[in-house]
């Protein structure tokens, strides 16, 4: 008799999830000499241990501590780039500006980027059919808790000037409910972080508005200033030119406003 399986509202675990995590780990540790000591089988075992046989609505940050310990990594604390709703451009930027890092440029972020996973209570099976949706089912699901945990740690590690890339095409350029707005902003340490610099990325070619005047940006400014961190805001009117100028800063067209 087939066993009854909980039907969740979100997509199931990404196919070939264990193989993908293991392969990503091997690739990452080969490319990054400072992480060559990492045993990828142990990393997978710790990852698996965080959610296998556990109710997928009852995951805690503590479940991920063994994985966090194995994935401990030092990135230059003054070279951190946060992002919200504009992941692709943020990643394109750090691929060019190699001394800056998004969360997904770290081992743990790289392992989990764009993946979904969950298990089932009291069985060692991975659920490939469905996983809990953050809104419709529960917030303490394996994926959400993972990103909350690594995002908090990443923000806590930041120092000096922290940059954040925000999507100027969204109705809420700064969204209090995003990972950046709900986790990272509140875990920047005023004793270490002097300034948060927001880069508001424009979508339209002819969009010359000053999006730093947007009410949601002023809300971010208020939150940050109350935490005794300076706030800076810059419009990136031409993201294509912005990337080009990161690649070729000597280009004569790169002295004007981007």
């Amino acid at each position: 008799v087939p066993r009854w399986r909980q039907q969740w509202s979100g997509p199931g675990t990404t196919k070939r999830f264990p193989e993908t995590v293991l392969a990503r780990c091997v690739k990452y540790t080969e490319i990054h000499p400072e992480m060559r000591h990492v045993d990828c089988q142990s990393v997978w075992d710790a990852f698996k241990g965080a959610f296998i046989s556990k109710h997928p609505c009852n995951i805690t940050e503590e479940d991920y501590q063994p994985l966090m310990k194995l994935g401990t990594q030092t990135v230059p604390c003054n070279k951190i780039l946060l992002w919200s709703r504009i992941k692709d451009l943020a990643h394109q930027f750090t691929q060019v500006q190699r001394d800056m890092f998004t969360l997904e440029d770290t081992l743990l972020g790289y392992l989990a980027d764009d993946l979904t996973w969950c298990g089932e209570f009291n069985t060692s099976k991975i659920n490939y059919q469905s996983c809990p949706d953050w809104r419709k089912d529960c917030s303490n699901n394996p994926v959400s808790v993972f990103w909350k945990t690594v995002s908090r740690r990443f923000a806590e590690a930041a120092c000096d000037v922290v940059h954040v890339m925000l999507n100027g095409s969204r109705s809420k350029i700064f969204d209090k409910n995003s990972t950046f707005g709900s986790v990272e902003v509140h875990n920047l340490q005023p004793e270490k972080v002097q300034t948060l610099e927001a880069w508001v990325i424009h979508g339209g070619r002819e969009d010359s508005r000053d999006l730093c005047q947007d009410p949601t940006i002023k809300e971010l400014e208020s939150i940050i200033s109350k935490r005794n961190i300076q706030f800076s805001c810059k419009n990136i009117y031409r993201p294509d030119k912005f990337l080009q100028c990161v690649k070729n800063p000597e280009d004569s067209s790169c002295t004007s406003e981007i």
Partner: antibody, heavy 119, light 107 residues
């Protein structure tokens, strides 16, 4: 080019009110905060208060009861008013621009308004 | 309020000297420190922020260091145009406060 130009009186009597206007160019008051400071031989440099780009203000508690900072974004002007002047308010008064949007230190300063309080 | 103390109010120096100016806060200011240079008749000008970051156009003979409560401004080889008064300012907490200044004078 960023500039801050101050206008205001030079000599005032005790108990009078000091009013200084700081007119800025080269940037918008909706993008940066404007701070007010003063410098005297006796007390050195003192931070008095700030009006942030959104219009909210923070004042040095020692001056809060007699200080008011307002602005008119459309005219690029910031207005400083200090009541109940006494002899020890004799100083050079400066407006200054915050280095970043919400900056706690200053990259451009006005030329200064020299105030002497004397009867 | 946080008190900022610059121990020497004036220094007699020679051109080419290495000059060190110190600034001590009454409590930890977590690297929220800037240095200004002021010449007679002028407003102060921003020199260094965040303890070590030189402002655009500031010569590389200027450098800043320190942490916690203790901070230092160093001029490696004093030039004529460096003769001025130097102030530190903390921006960890309001009211933002300044040191009393250190005036450099030529011997």
């Amino acid at each position: 080019e960023v500039q801050l130009k101050q206008s205001g009186p030079g000599l005032m009597q005790p108990s009078q009110s000091l009013s200084i206007t700081c007119t800025v160019s080269g940037f918008s008051l909706t993008s940066y905060g404007i701070h007010w400071l003063r410098q005297s031989p006796g007390k050195g440099l003192e931070w008095l208060g700030v009006i942030w780009r959104g219009g909210s203000t923070d004042y040095n508690a020692a001056f809060m009861s007699r200080l008011s900072i307002t602005k008119d974004n459309s005219k690029s002007q910031v207005f400083f008013k200090m009541n109940s002047l006494q002899g020890d308010d004799t100083a050079i008064y400066y407006c200054a621009k915050g280095k970043v949007t919400t900056g706690f230190y200053f990259d451009f300063w006005g030329q200064g308004t020299t105030l002497t309080v004397s009867s | 309020d946080i008190q900022m103390t610059q121990s020497s109010s004036s220094f007699s120096v020679s051109l080419g000297d290495r000059v060190t100016i110190t600034c001590k806060a009454s409590e930890d200011i977590y690297n929220r420190l800037v240095w200004y240079q002021q010449k007679p008749g002028n407003a102060p000008g921003l020199l260094i922020s965040g303890v070590t970051s030189l402002e655009t156009g500031v010569p590389s003979r200027f450098s800043g260091s320190g942490s916690g409560k203790d901070y230092t401004l160093t001029i490696t080889s004093l030039q004529t145009e460096d003769v001025a008064t130097y102030y530190c300012q903390q921006y960890w907490s309001t009211p933002y406060t300044f040191g009393g200044g250190t005036k450099l004078e030529i011997k």
